[in-house]
């Protein structure tokens, strides 16, 4: 099966990064994090279509058995295939210092 | 936030390791796979309610957008954390072999 | 461990271009939200900032000296350049290159001192 | 740009005080100054940030106040090593500027 970047539901239909604007306050972070006071949150937002970016073989099976049990077995979906690294200024209870964060923001998106 | 193992929707309503029986017709894969016929496919499967089984940041991220713009940002995705390697007896143009396959089964899940 | 080290000339002549390398190592300039800025100190006087880049090549200055600053970096070799055009007596001062996350200064080069002399 | 005004060029204080050091903004920052201690012959090092929070590491003995235009460091228990400059920085909008710097003196 080709696992492929073609959208059958139109374009910007499926599984893609999407750019998010959120405030501390939005996030839930208000009471920890200092800076940024506004994070542009990359996430991967999307359907996946029969084999749209599947990840791997796992995410193949998960198409052909949604296709025949679609009450049981749910389409395979839209997450981050990788992460870009952030830095977060952060309070600590030693004082405010700089965090980096590997699994904050996404980088690419795959269906699985 | 607590990435919590209790499901507040109720007993194996939320994100976890499933097992669906499924033949090689069901896969797709008659032509290609001799053995086994049958495969028992772990998936994962179910809801991924607030901090239940976060993977990462991200996920605690993805829930706290959910919850402020629940039709733009999706809820977290009950997707395998780990997988467990296959082996399948297949067809090759020179004749038949044992391949292994990692990414297969799913061992353990989480949200993301 | 993070280390920022600023080389210079020393010396220069009014007129001439002063070209500042930070190096460093102990983090990345391509994480989000890391940046590097270039400050500088005349002897016995207080702290002024230069300029300013992002792990996203996006550039600040500052508009008193804007026209003659370029700031610029080399993600994959660490390292942060500023170049000061038309160098006078006044430009005489000690400069640092600092790192930031977003707008946190927590570490200081040990700084670079610049004299310019006819 | 914003000003940065800090009108106590020097400041004189015995071992064991209490000191407070300010910094008068142009116009309104919001929380958004920093502190620096600068010793002699060294680079500035961080203490206070968003006007209250103190740098990792940072005793407890250095507290940063005030919101708007007004800000405050105090070093209260003095030490001898706390002989040094201190300048207030904003970083509410481009230029960031900083103060002209408060010399303390150990008596």
């Known amino acids: 099966a080709r696992n492929g970047d073609h959208c059958p539901l139109g374009p910007g239909r499926c599984c893609r990064l999407h750019t998010v604007r959120a405030s501390l306050e939005d996030l839930g972070w208000a009471d920890w994090v200092l800076s940024p006071r506004e994070v542009q949150v990359t996430m991967c937002i999307g359907a996946c279509p029969s084999q749209f970016r599947a990840a791997n073989m796992h995410a193949q099976i998960k198409t052909s058995l949604h296709r025949l049990k679609p009450d049981t077995v749910p389409a395979p979906c839209c997450v981050p295939a990788s992460y870009n690294p952030m830095v977060l200024i952060q309070k600590t209870d030693t004082g405010v210092s700089l965090q980096t964060y590997d699994d904050l923001l996404a980088k690419d998106c795959h269906c699985i | 936030a607590r990435n919590g193992d209790h499901c507040p929707l109720g007993p194996g309503r939320c994100c976890r390791l499933h097992t669906v029986r499924a033949s090689l017709e069901d896969l797709g894969w008659a032509d290609w796979v001799l053995s086994p016929r049958e495969v028992q496919v772990t998936m994962c499967i179910g809801a991924c309610p607030s901090q239940f089984r976060a993977a990462n940041m991200h996920a605690q991220i993805k829930t706290s957008l959910h919850r402020l713009k629940p039709d733009t940002v999706p809820a977290p995705c009950c997707v395998p954390a780990s997988y467990n390697p296959m082996v399948l007896i297949q067809k090759t143009d020179t004749g038949v072999s044992l391949q292994t396959y990692d990414d297969l089964l799913a061992k353990d899940c989480h949200c993301i | 461990q993070v280390t920022l080290k600023e080389s210079g000339p020393g010396i220069l002549q009014p007129s001439q271009t002063l070209s500042l390398t930070c190096s460093f190592s102990g983090f990345s300039l391509t994480i989000s939200g890391m940046g590097v800025s270039w400050i500088r100190q005349p002897s016995g006087k207080g702290l002024e900032w230069l300029a300013h880049i992002y792990w996203d090549d996006d550039k600040r200055y500052n508009p008193s000296l804007k026209s003659r600053l370029t700031i610029s970096k080399d993600t994959s070799s660490n390292q942060v350049f500023l170049e000061i055009t038309s160098v006078d007596t006044a430009d005489t001062a000690t400069y640092y290159c600092?790192?930031?996350?977003?707008?946190?200064?927590?570490?200081w080069g040990q700084g670079t001192t610049l004299t310019v002399s006819s | 740009d914003i000003v940065m005004t800090q009108s106590q060029k020097f400041m004189s204080t015995s071992v064991g005080d209490r000191v407070s050091v300010t910094c008068k903004a142009s116009?309104?920052?919001?929380?958004?100054v920093a502190w620096y201690q600068q010793k002699p012959g060294q680079s500035p090092k961080g203490l206070i940030y968003s006007a209250s929070y103190r740098y990792s590491g940072v005793p407890d003995r250095f507290t940063g106040s005030g919101s708007g235009t007004d800000f405050t460091l105090t070093i209260s228990n003095v030490q001898s090593e706390d002989l040094a400059e201190y300048f207030c920085?904003?970083?509410?909008?481009?230029?960031?500027?900083f103060g002209g710097g408060t010399k303390l003196e150990i008596k």
């Open positions: 116009q309104n920052v919001g929380t958004n």
């Open positions: 920085q904003q970083y509410n909008s481009y230029p960031w500027t």
């Open positions: 600092v790192r930031a996350g977003w707008d946190f200064f927590d570490y």
